[in-house]
């Protein structure tokens, strides 16, 4: 039964169990052609060297062919994400062949043994593909391997072993343990297909990382930084999911990669965009919302092939459920001066007003200290499409950095009760939409009144498209 720390603990246990516990099973990999969207339909099993099932089951040689490859399993059953993905692929690509690679007997093992079985399963898939290539009209370029967790590395092996080059491999949160830092031939890598795209949703820099942290594809997408996924916190899970344990948090975050991919198939009109960035912190600061030189891309099925750069790390924020799309904004706020700020660190809040909708009050996450007489960059995202932005309401609060600073503030206030209030001077806000790439400048509604005290609000209206300001006098360094 699960350890108190769920799959993380179980996986740690699995890594240290003696070999003797392993169940004896006959090595077996089956290929199930899903001939119906109905998940209860038994489908058709393909057999290497036997052409009749291909004909009987209506295998379309000229169409796209998807191979779905599951990962390690503790229960030995196909989990419910599988039929969701099968159905989504059938919905999106009606003529496609959707094949489920059933390697359950080899995956329902100690984790270490399942890892050791990935190579043989990859080899079985490669042999199946080599045989299909002998058929007229079948093209390896039309093959898309979709591997979840351990299955992503199986896909890598398959791509490595096959004669020729597979069109695409999508890695859905490729497994981390025993693959992190491994040689490129022993894990999923960009060499394994013409295009390798990867979604990382459960990475941890501390403890056991169920998903691989390192980039392993042509593009590696880290939704929400690749770690804590919205809707998967313990509170969310206790309220809305089965079991309501740490186990379920892990499952929720790890499996989120599958649901993001399903979302990209079924919500074609609501594509999520990711933005190239060197690391998560820089993305959180809002400085990576560029689409120039292939720096942004759709995620999941709609990702555009990018082979010019290897290991391009990309980031985005998402909602807690389908459709996952959010709207990203970069906000540049130039703080001209502090007044009586002491040791207080301001926290900004903005409300965005648009032609379609208005946002909630959104906190601006502070990644680094807010600089005085400098431009501070923030990332803001909304779940709704606000349309064209019209105005922005800004407020701020003082958040003390420590109890000692709080005491100093209080003592200072008590000794100088008539000390004028703390103020910030902000004259404009520059906004860039990640999704539309539009740049807008918002100026203080009252140019004579640009100082703002904690809890007060300052209104900014759109004053021009673009960011370049003409005839501007400023006592400080100007933005490029």
């Amino acid at each position: 039964s699960p350890t108190p720390f769920g799959p993380e603990g179980q996986l740690a246990d699995e890594l240290h169990k003696p070999k003797a516990i392993q169940t004896e099973v006959k090595p077996s990999v089956r290929f199930n052609l899903r001939t119906s969207k109905d998940p209860e339909h038994e489908g058709c099993y393909l057999s290497l060297g036997h052409s009749q099932p291909l004909e009987d089951c209506g295998f379309n040689m000229t169409a796209k062919t998807f191979f779905i490859i599951h990962g390690w399993t503790m229960s030995g059953i196909f989990e419910n994400w599988l039929h969701k993905l099968v159905s989504a692929l059938h919905t999106r690509e009606k003529d496609a062949n959707v094949v489920v690679v059933d390697w359950l007997p080899l995956a329902h093992q100690l984790y270490t043994d399942a890892v050791n079985n990935t190579r043989v399963v990859g080899h079985s898939i490669a042999r199946m593909l080599d045989w299909l290539q002998e058929k007229d009209d079948f093209s390896l370029g039309n093959v898309h391997l979709i591997g979840y967790s351990l299955g992503a590395h199986v896909a890598g092996y398959a791509g490595n072993f096959v004669k020729g080059t597979v069109g695409r491999i999508t890695g859905l949160d490729p497994a981390g343990p025993m693959f992190e830092g491994a040689d490129i031939h022993k894990r999923l890598s960009p060499d394994d297909a013409d295009f390798v795209d990867v979604l990382h949703t459960y990475t941890r820099s501390f403890g056991l990382s169920i998903g691989i942290q390192m980039p392993v594809g042509h593009i590696d997408i880290y939704p929400n930084g690749g770690d804590f996924q919205p809707g998967c916190g313990l509170n969310d899970v206790l309220g809305s999911m089965a079991y309501g344990t740490i186990t379920e948090v892990v499952k929720c975050e790890h499996e989120r990669a599958v649901h993001l991919f399903v979302d990209s198939l079924v919500n074609q009109d609501k594509p999520s965009f990711a933005f190239q960035c060197t690391d998560s912190n820089r993305f959180k600061k809002g400085i990576c919302l560029s689409c120039r030189k292939n720096r942004c891309n759709s995620i999941g099925y709609n990702a555009k092939k990018m082979r010019n750069k290897r290991n391009s790390k990309m980031y985005l924020k998402t909602r807690a459920g389908m459709p996952f799309r959010v709207y990203h904004y970069q906000m540049k706020i130039h703080v001209f001066s502090y007044k009586n700020m002491g040791e207080i660190e301001p926290t900004f809040y903005v409300t965005l007003y648009g032609t379609n909708a208005d946002s909630q009050t959104l906190p601006l996450e502070i990644v680094e200290r807010i600089e005085q007489n400098a431009t501070n960059t923030f990332l803001v995202y909304t779940e709704e499409d606000l349309g064209d932005l019209l105005k922005i309401q800004l407020t701020w609060e003082g958040a003390s950095q420590s109890w000692y600073n709080l005491w100093k503030e209080l003592r200072s206030y008590l000794s100088q009760p008539h000390n004028p209030g703390r103020e910030l001077n902000i004259r404009r806000i520059r906004v860039k939409s990640g999704e539309t790439q539009r740049k807008l400048t918002f100026c203080a509604e009252d140019p004579e009144n640009t100082s703002i005290s904690p809890g007060r609000e300052l209104w900014f209206r759109k004053c021009r498209d673009g960011w370049r300001m003409k005839n501007e006098t400023s006592p400080t360094v100007e933005l490029p």
């Epitope: 099973v25 209860e40 229960s75 030995g76 196909f78 079991y243």
Partner: antibody, heavy 120, light 112 residues
């Protein structure tokens, strides 16, 4: 049509071993998992576990680990439940029921049940 | 393990009236928009028979007077109008991703 036919009722002494069968017909045996469910007299249903009919790998519920064993004779499309060291509390009707590997795991076809009774 | 609690344990309903059976799960059985709750009917001396799967889907061949609803932890089986042949014990069952797949304690329906 799809059918699951189980072996007949048996009277067993405590300590004995009993093996009941479930023969499937009307579908490809290895394409569906097989469950075993216990129902004590006048009581509700209790899931015992299941067996992967292709690989032969069994999974047991916690209360049925140890004395209970699931097995297969694939060529005969038959699943078996063996109970070792039969006890009085094993007196019950045992059902086999199939489920789809690819779907939502509900039990769509059931055997007629095999009644096992402990004889003193 | 997920515990399913059915209520009432037994009920008597007049012919043509509505029978409502409740099933409460100790934790949610929802997953990505679906509820993994099933309902079975069992008559004395017979095996259980699937009526409803995934909370509200009627198995083919089952009369439309049977319907299922609910999500999360609260589920209901409705039979309307009740007929003589509906006298039986009804069980709910959850089949989430992680076995054990548990059953409720059962509800015995009598026809008045």
């Amino acid at each position: 049509q799809i059918q699951l036919v189980q072996s007949g009722p048996e009277l067993k002494k405590p300590g004995e071993t009993v093996k009941i069968s479930c023969k499937a017909s009307g579908y490809t045996f290895t394409n569906y998992g097989m469950n075993w469910v216990k129902q004590a007299p006048g009581k509700g249903l209790k899931w015992m576990g299941w067996i992967n009919t292709y690989s032969g790998v069994p999974t047991y519920a916690d209360d049925f680990k140890g004395r209970f064993a699931f097995s297969l004779e694939t060529s005969a499309s038959t699943a078996y439940l063996q109970i070792n060291n039969f006890k009085n509390e094993d007196t019950a009707t045992y059902f086999c029921a199939r489920f789809s590997y690819y779907g939502r795991h509900y039990f769509d076809y059931w055997g007629q049940g095999t009644a096992l009774t402990a004889s003193s | 393990d997920i515990v399913l609690t059915q209520s009432p344990a037994s009920l008597a309903v007049s012919l043509g009236q509505r029978a409502t059976i409740s099933c409460k799960a100790s934790q949610s059985v929802d997953y990505d928009g679906d509820s993994y709750m099933n309902w079975y009917q069992q008559k004395p001396g017979q095996p259980p028979k699937l009526l409803i799967y995934a909370a509200s889907n009627l198995k083919s061949g089952i009369p439309a007077r049977f319907s299922g609803s609910g999500s999360g932890t609260d589920f209901t089986l409705n039979i309307h109008p009740v007929e003589e042949e509906d006298a039986a014990t009804y069980y709910c069952q959850q089949t989430t991703d992680d076995p054990p797949w548990t059953f409720g304690g059962g509800t015995k329906l009598e026809i008045k």
